[in-house]
Amino acid sequence: DVNEAPQFSQHVFQAKVSEDVAIGTKVGNVTAKDPEGLDISYSLRGDTRGWLKIDHVTGEIFSVAPLDREAGSPYRVQVVATEVGGSSLSSVSEFHLILMDVNDNPPRLAKDYTGLFFCHPLSAPGSLIFEATDDDQHLFRGPHFTFSLGSGSLQNDWEVSKINGTHARLSTRHTEFEEREYVVLIRINDGGRPPLEGIVSLPVTFCSCVEGSCFRPAGHKHHHHHH
């Protein structure tokens, strides 16, 4: 009669939790039985992020640190079931913690928008397009950002209009701009739960142009056309 290792009740174990669960929350559990009826002790292996602990007797798994979906999901650890007494034989399975995203990343500009310019003087109102993003996971649909000017005083000179869920157009309201840099603040709201807002700045230079680029005296860099 050969002593057999414990047998897990499932091939693998999975649990879905919101990434913002409180520390100490039960996030899942594993179960195994020993063919000889011996008691089983559970342990975790490979908890590289130090997020979890297991109750050695019940197999219940708890969070011991803040979880972060952006660190990678599902988070996979090994669970070990070991006979108590006898030959101390053990079996290994896997516990996968699926982290459901909460809205915890404010919107930001999708790329570096330095170097935006208009040729001065403007012959007609001008516009440029910019893109927003965030670091949250958007299940089943892309992000749906809304855009507005960051302060009321900007509304005399600028307007912002949404193109789609990620892109918007910044337009001048008139042509009477000085030959200098204007910093336009844009408010981007992600419409999430809870909604998060980011205020970003688009630096726009009005400058004399030579062959389609901003002319700068020696020692200054040329700006390149982005619109």
Epitope: S9, Q10, H11, V12, Q14, K16, G46, P74, R76, V92, E94, H96, I98
Partner: antibody, heavy 116, light 107 residues
Framework: QVQLQQPGAELAKPGASVKMSCKAS????????MHWMKQRPGQGQEWIGY????????EYNQKFKDKATLTADKSSSTAYMQLSSLTSEDSAVYYC?????????WGQGTTLTVSS | DIVMTQSPASLSASVGETVTITCRTS??????LAWYQHKEGKSPQLLVY???VLADGVPLRFSGSGSGTQYSLKINSLQSEDVARYYC?????????FGSGTKLEIK
């Protein structure tokens, strides 16, 4: 990036054995179980079994217990499946696949033809 | 063994349409279910795991739903590149088993 490389084809005679390989790259080979599947033309996938390369623990579908033997060589990050006592029923495409929740990466498959 | 009953066996739809494939299991598998797309001459690709979670890089027009013994895969706004065979598979306990597949064609 993660890759599982399998030879495109194997030819064997009835009654013989064949050992097919699955070379893993782009991840820690020992950290993920490797599964094997069989697919015959016009039929669904059948799960053969898996090996845990870090412990060499194997588990088989009862249907393939006397047909397939799974092994792994950590030094070359390669998983192997040997099929014995081949018959025409063993002619199929065999896939290796890395285990996560489901199989997140698959090899291209090895087409085994058993013919005299 | 857990039996996976997938339907329909084949379906044809137009670009832009929404299609749904269903998978019924012979016992409760508690959302331990994956969906795969298998294109001719390629390896299968994981679309959904844990019944509802989209795998990395999968277009947002794919979605999974269900629990207990009833599961479905929905493809919104069908594209020509979605032509493939689709499989459900449980990983609740061994032996792991697959559905018989649904062949999706474009009208």
């Amino acid at each position: 990036q993660v890759q599982l490389q399998q030879p495109g084809a194997e030819l064997a005679k009835p009654g013989a054995s064949v050992k097919m390989s699955c070379k893993a790259s782009g991840y820690s080979f020992s950290s993920y179980w490797m599964h094997w599947m069989k697919q015959r033309p016009g039929q669904g996938q059948e799960w053969i079994g898996y090996i845990n390369p870090s412990t060499d623990y194997t588990e088989y579908n009862q249907k393939f217990k006397d047909k397939a033997t799974l092994t792994a060589d950590k030094s070359s990050s390669t998983a192997y499946m040997q099929l014995s006592s081949l018959t025409s029923e063993d002619s199929a495409v065999y896939y290796c696949a890395r285990s996560r929740l489901g199989f997140d990466y698959w090899g291209q498959g090895t087409t085994l033809t058993v013919s005299s | 063994d857990i039996v996976m009953t997938q339907s329909p066996a084949s379906l044809s739809a137009s670009v832009g349409e929404t299609v749904t494939i269903t998978c019924r299991t012979s016992e409760n598998i508690d959302s331990y279910l994956a969906w795969y797309q298998h294109k001719e001459g390629k390896s299968p690709q994981l679309l959904v795991y844990a019944a509802t979670v989209l795998a990395d890089g999968v277009p947002l027009r794919f979605s999974g739903s269900g629990s207990g013994t009833q599961y479905s895969l929905k493809i919104n706004s069908l594209q020509s590149e979605d032509v493939a065979r689709y499989y459900c598979q449980h990983y609740y306990r061994t032996p792991l088993t697959f559905g018989s597949g649904t062949k999706l064609e474009i009208k």
